[in-house]
Structures are given as structure tokens and as C-alpha cells.
């Protein structure tokens, strides 16, 4: 999906009001020094591409993020504020139902959510290169 035509400001508002708080709840008890951000993004569409990938695609050691509250709210925000996003997700959702696993918070998941916080931070404030 090409995130170029999303309403970035509306997504940002949704992130600040709810999604960010759910991410903090998920990470509660984790030291702020524990994880270094290794995934980066260069502009808002790129950030949303990386956010979608880390939130919804199962990875080795962390297969369960898609059912978390922050993930459901992320999906809703993208569906509302990115034209045509919902249609592209129907097949992905059906595939997800088939491979649903028991919800377990692993250290790998905590690291992944820490990366998500970093991606959202850069989505909110892409550091523009000096002219």
C-alpha cells in the first residue's frame, strides 16, 4: 500500500491521543535505556510503511502484536485516514486469522514495540535536511 495520500495530521492526532498511550502501557516496566532504535524512516509515507510492517507482520520471536490494543487502533486510524487502505487489508486479515497464536509478551516483542515508538516519533517529526 502506498501511504502517500494519507491524512498525516489526522493520523498524528490519533497517535498522540490514544495509540501512544497504549504503546506506553505495553512497554510498562521496561527501562527506557533498554533498547536502541535500529529501524528508521526518512519521511511520513516511509514511516507508515515501516509502522505497518512492524505492527502487523509476525516476526521471529514475536507473532502476537496484531491483536494488541495499539495495533487495533493503528489499523483503525489507517483505515479511516488512508484512502483505499481497508481494501488492501482484507486478504491480510483473513491470513492473520488462520495463524492466530496465544498472546505472549516476549522480550522480542518489547524490543519490536520500542522500535515502533521510534518510528512513530519520526513520523511525528521527520527531521528535515537543511536547505
Amino acid at each position: 500500500y502506498d501511504f502517500t495520500n494519507c491524512d498525516f495530521e489526522k493520523i498524528k492526532a490519533a497517535y498522540l491521543s490514544t495509540i501512544s498511550k497504549d504503546l506506553i502501557t505495553y512497554m510498562s516496566g521496561t527501562k527506557s535505556t533498554e533498547f536502541n532504535n535500529t529501524v528508521s524512516c526518512s519521511n511520513r509515507p516511509h514511516c507508515l510503511t515501516e509502522i505497518q510492517s512492524l505492527t502487523f507482520n509476525p516476526t521471529a520471536g514475536c507473532a502476537s502484536l496484531a491483536k494488541e490494543m495499539f495495533a487495533m487502533k493503528t489499523k483503525a486510524a489507517l483505515a479511516i485516514w488512508c484512502p483505499g487502505y481497508s481494501e488492501t487489508q482484507i486478504n491480510a486479515t483473513q491470513a492473520m486469522k488462520k495463524r492466530r497464536k496465544r498472546k505472549v509478551t516476549t522480550n522480542k516483542c518489547l524490543e519490536q514495540v520500542s522500535q515502533l515508538q521510534g518510528l512513530w516519533r519520526r513520523f511525528n517529526r521527520p527531521l528535515l535536511k537543511q536547505q
Partner: antibody
Framework: QVQLVQSGAEVKKPGASVKVSCKAS????????IEWVRQAPGQGLEWMGI????????YYAQKFQGRVTLTADKSTSTAYMELSSLRSEDSAVYYC????????????WGQGTTLTVSS | DIQMTQSPSSLSASVGDRVTITCRAS??????LVWYQQKPGKAPQLLIY???NLQSGVPSRFSGSGSGTQFTLTISSLQPEDFATYYC?????????FGTGTKLEIK
């Protein structure tokens, strides 16, 4: 807990340079942008520039471009602000600040470094 | 660059009063606005981010509203520790700029 500790007060002559340090602790230094803000006596806050400690990317306010240099030392979790060709109008308190978890504000500030420029 | 204008520049009020400070942006900044409180000789402290979100640990008597170019900070019932200078700042794009400040004094 998160802390930004700045270097001590400086007295400089016009035309000289100053380098202020900002040592960060209590968080992953390279994950967050560091910004520099100054405040002249009795005046408001003035944004100077920003650095990404991970990449070294910087952005300076037009007013300071060519005179200010922001750097970061990942090994010591320290950010630096160097201001050259000092003039009396540069007398101010200089603050470093860390962006928040959401990137929508500054949530922690240094205690400030007072710079006096006088002949 | 985006200019931020605050009004009033100073304000006298009494403990228990409801106070409103306004910040105007020279162009649309959506909800990308922050409010800080600063006391003499101290660094600013974050009150509100994203125009309306209360920073953790900040008393609920502080609230923010507005979007686009017009924003307000409201203190519902002034407490003695609220007498300070308040600044808005846009977080829309680089370069960031601060408002001119509002000094809140005891009447």
C-alpha cells in the same frame, strides 16, 4: 531517571567562541533528538537548532546558520553547542532539551548554561 | 518561518480565578502546539502537547484547546504556584518557534 546536565557558566570576549556541553543519562541517547534553545535576560525563548545524535543530522535556525555548530558524542551520550563570533547580544542562558517519547514536545531540559559576552 | 503570537503579554489575576491565554500561529499548524510554564531562573516545564494532551504529572486544572491557527491554554482555578510565564511553541515543521510569552502575575 532522565537527566540533562549542562556545563558551567562562561564569560567570553566579543569575537571569541564558546562550546557548551549537555550530558544525557537515564535514556537511550541516540533514540531522541536534542534541541538547543536560548533566553536572553528578561526575554523570551529562542529556538536555535536540532541534532539527531544517531545520524549527526542537524538543522539550524536561519539566524544562527554559519555561527552555530551542533555535535553529539555517542560514546559519552553528550551533545555540544558551539557558537562562534560572539557578540554582546549572545549573552543569554542556553538550554539543551530532549524530545519526548512521542516526538511532539520537549519533556526534559538541561538546567541552563549562562553565557556572558563582555569586553 | 511560522510566527507565534501570544496574548495578553501580561495578566494579573487572583488565586481561584479562571484564566485563558491565547496563542495564534501565522499559518495552519493543525494540532502541533505545545504549552510550557517557566518560573524565574528555571528551565521551562511541559504542560500540554498536541494542543490538548495533558503531560503526565501536570494538574488537571490546566487544559489546552484549538487547532489550525488559534489555540488557548486555560487554568480553571489559579493556584499560588501557577504564577509564572507561559509560552506556546509550534511543533509543525523545522524551524520551530516560540510564542512571545505571557507573564501571569498576582493581582
Amino acid at each position: 531517571q532522565v537527566q540533562l546536565v549542562q556545563s558551567g557558566a562562561e564569560v567570553k570576549k566579543p569575537g571569541a567562541s564558546v562550546k557548551v556541553s549537555c550530558k544525557a543519562s537515564g535514556y537511550a541517547f541516540t533514540n531522541y533528538l536534542i534541541e538547543w534553545v536560548r533566553q536572553a535576560p528578561g526575554q523570551g525563548l529562542e529556538w536555535m537548532g536540532i541534532i539527531n545524535p544517531e545520524s549527526g543530522d542537524t538543522y539550524y535556525a536561519q539566524k544562527f546558520q554559519g555561527r552555530v555548530t551542533l555535535t553529539a558524542d555517542k560514546s559519552t551520550s553528550t551533545a555540544y553547542m558551539e557558537l562562534s563570533s560572539l557578540r554582546s547580544e549572545d549573552s543569554a542562558v542556553y538550554y539543551c532539551a530532549k524530545e519526548s517519547l512521542t516526538g511532539s514536545s520537549y519533556d526534559y531540559w538541561g538546567q541552563g548554561t549562562t553565557l556572558t559576552v563582555s569586553s | 518561518d511560522i510566527q507565534m503570537t501570544q496574548s495578553p503579554s501580561s495578566l494579573s489575576a487572583s488565586v481561584g480565578d479562571r484564566v485563558t491565554i491565547t496563542c495564534r500561529a501565522s499559518e495552519n499548524i493543525y494540532s502541533n502546539l505545545v504549552w510550557y510554564q517557566q518560573k524565574p531562573g528555571k528551565a521551562p516545564q511541559l504542560l500540554i502537547y498536541g494542543a490538548r494532551n495533558l503531560q503526565s504529572g501536570v494538574p488537571s486544572r490546566f487544559s489546552g484547546s484549538g487547532s489550525g491557527t488559534q489555540f488557548t491554554l486555560t487554568i480553571s482555578s489559579l493556584q499560588p504556584e501557577d504564577f509564572a510565564t507561559y509560552y506556546c511553541q509550534h511543533f509543525y515543521e523545522t524551524p520551530l518557534t516560540f510564542g512571545t510569552g505571557t507573564k501571569l502575575e498576582i493581582k
